[in-house]
C-alpha cells in the first residue's frame, strides 16, 4: 500500500520560518502534489502550494519556496509573521496523486519538542498515515 510521509521543522535560526518536507512511498509516478495547512481537526484549512511535474509550481503566502527534492518528494519553506504565522498546533497536510492509481494524504505538525528556544531535531521521524 502506498504511503505518504511528512516532516515539519522549525528553523532554529529563524523562529518564524518552517520547513515542510513530504514524500511518497509507492511505485506509481506522481501526477500532482498539494500541500495544505490549517487548525487541528480539519479547522480552517487552505492550500499552500500545488506542484505539477509538467505544468509547474504554484504557491501562496506564507509559502516562500516550494520545490521538488526528488521525483517523489517535495519541500516547502514557510515564512510567517502575525496572523499568517504557523503556531505549534498548526496541521500541515501533503496529498500525493498518482494518476490513474489514486491519491494519498498524510498530515503532521510541529513536534512537541520544538520549543522556540530549542533547536529542532535535524531528522525528525516521519509521520505516516495510509488511508
Amino acid at each position: 500500500t502506498p504511503e505518504v510521509w511528512v516532516q515539519v521543522r522549525m528553523e532554529a535560526t529563524e523562529l518564524s520560518s518552517f520547513t515542510i518536507r513530504c514524500g511518497f512511498l509507492g511505485s506509481g509516478s506522481i501526477s500532482l502534489v498539494t500541500v495544505s495547512w490549517g487548525g487541528p481537526n480539519g479547522a480552517g484549512g487552505t492550500t499552500l502550494a500545488v506542484l505539477h511535474p509538467e505544468r509547474g509550481i504554484r504557491q501562496w503566502a506564507p509559502a516562500r519556496q516550494a520545490r521538488w527534492e526528488t521525483q517523489s518528494s517535495i519541500s516547502l519553506i514557510l515564512e510567517g509573521s502575525g496572523a499568517s504565522s504557523p503556531c505549534a498546533n498548526t496541521t500541515f497536510c501533503c496529498k500525493f496523486a498518482s494518476f490513474p492509481e489514486g491519491s494519498w494524504e498524510a498530515c503532521g505538525s510541529l513536534p512537541p519538542s520544538s520549543d522556540p528556544g530549542l533547536s529542532a531535531p535535524p531528522t525528525p521521524a516521519p509521520i505516516l498515515r495510509a488511508d
Epitope: L32, T34, G45, T47, V50, R55, T91, S103, W104
Partner: nanobody, 127 residues
Framework: EVQLVESGGGLVQPGGSLRLSCAAS????????MSWVRQAPGKGLEWVST????????SYVDSVKGRFTISRDNSKNTLYLQMNSLRAEDTAVYYC????????????????????WGQGTMVTVSS
C-alpha cells in the same frame, strides 16, 4: 487512500433539475478547494465550477452561470452541484475533483491535473 464518490446523475428532461453529490473520504476535505468538471460524449474535459475550502468563494464557467450552484458541507465531507434549467448541452459525465484548474490554466484539461478525482456520474438531458 482518498476516495471521491459521485452520485445523483440520471436522465432528466430539458428544463429539469438534478443535484449531484460527492462523498469524500481519506483526506482532510475541509483544507482543499474542490471542483466539478465534465466530459461530454466525444469531447474533452471541461471545467464547470470551483468552491474554495471554506465555501466562501465560488466560480463558474459562463455556460452554467445562473443555472448551477456549487456548495459544500465540510461537516459531512460532501460536495454538491445543484443543476437547474438543464439543457441538452449539459449532457456529460460529471466528475468531482480536488483542486482548482485555474492554478495551471484550463487548456487541455485532464483528470491528471487534479489532486483527487471520482469515477464520475452520467447526466443525460433529453426529451
Amino acid at each position: 487512500e482518498v476516495q471521491l464518490v459521485e452520485s445523483g446523475g440520471g436522465l432528466v428532461q430539458p428544463g429539469g433539475s438534478l443535484r449531484l453529490s460527492c462523498a469524500a473520504s481519506g483526506f482532510t476535505f475541509s483544507y482543499y478547494d474542490m471542483s466539478w468538471v465534465r466530459q461530454a460524449p466525444g469531447k474533452g474535459l471541461e471545467w464547470v465550477s470551483t468552491i474554495n475550502s471554506n465555501g466562501g468563494r465560488t466560480s463558474y464557467v459562463d455556460s452554467v452561470k445562473g443555472r448551477f450552484t456549487i456548495s459544500r458541507d465540510n461537516s459531512k465531507n460532501t460536495l454538491y452541484l445543484q443543476m437547474n434549467s438543464l439543457r441538452a448541452e449539459d449532457t456529460a459525465v460529471y466528475y468531482c475533483v480536488e483542486g482548482d484548474p485555474h492554478n495551471f490554466g484550463l487548456e487541455s484539461l485532464s483528470l491528471r491535473d487534479f489532486g483527487s478525482w471520482g469515477q464520475g456520474t452520467m447526466v443525460t438531458v433529453s426529451s
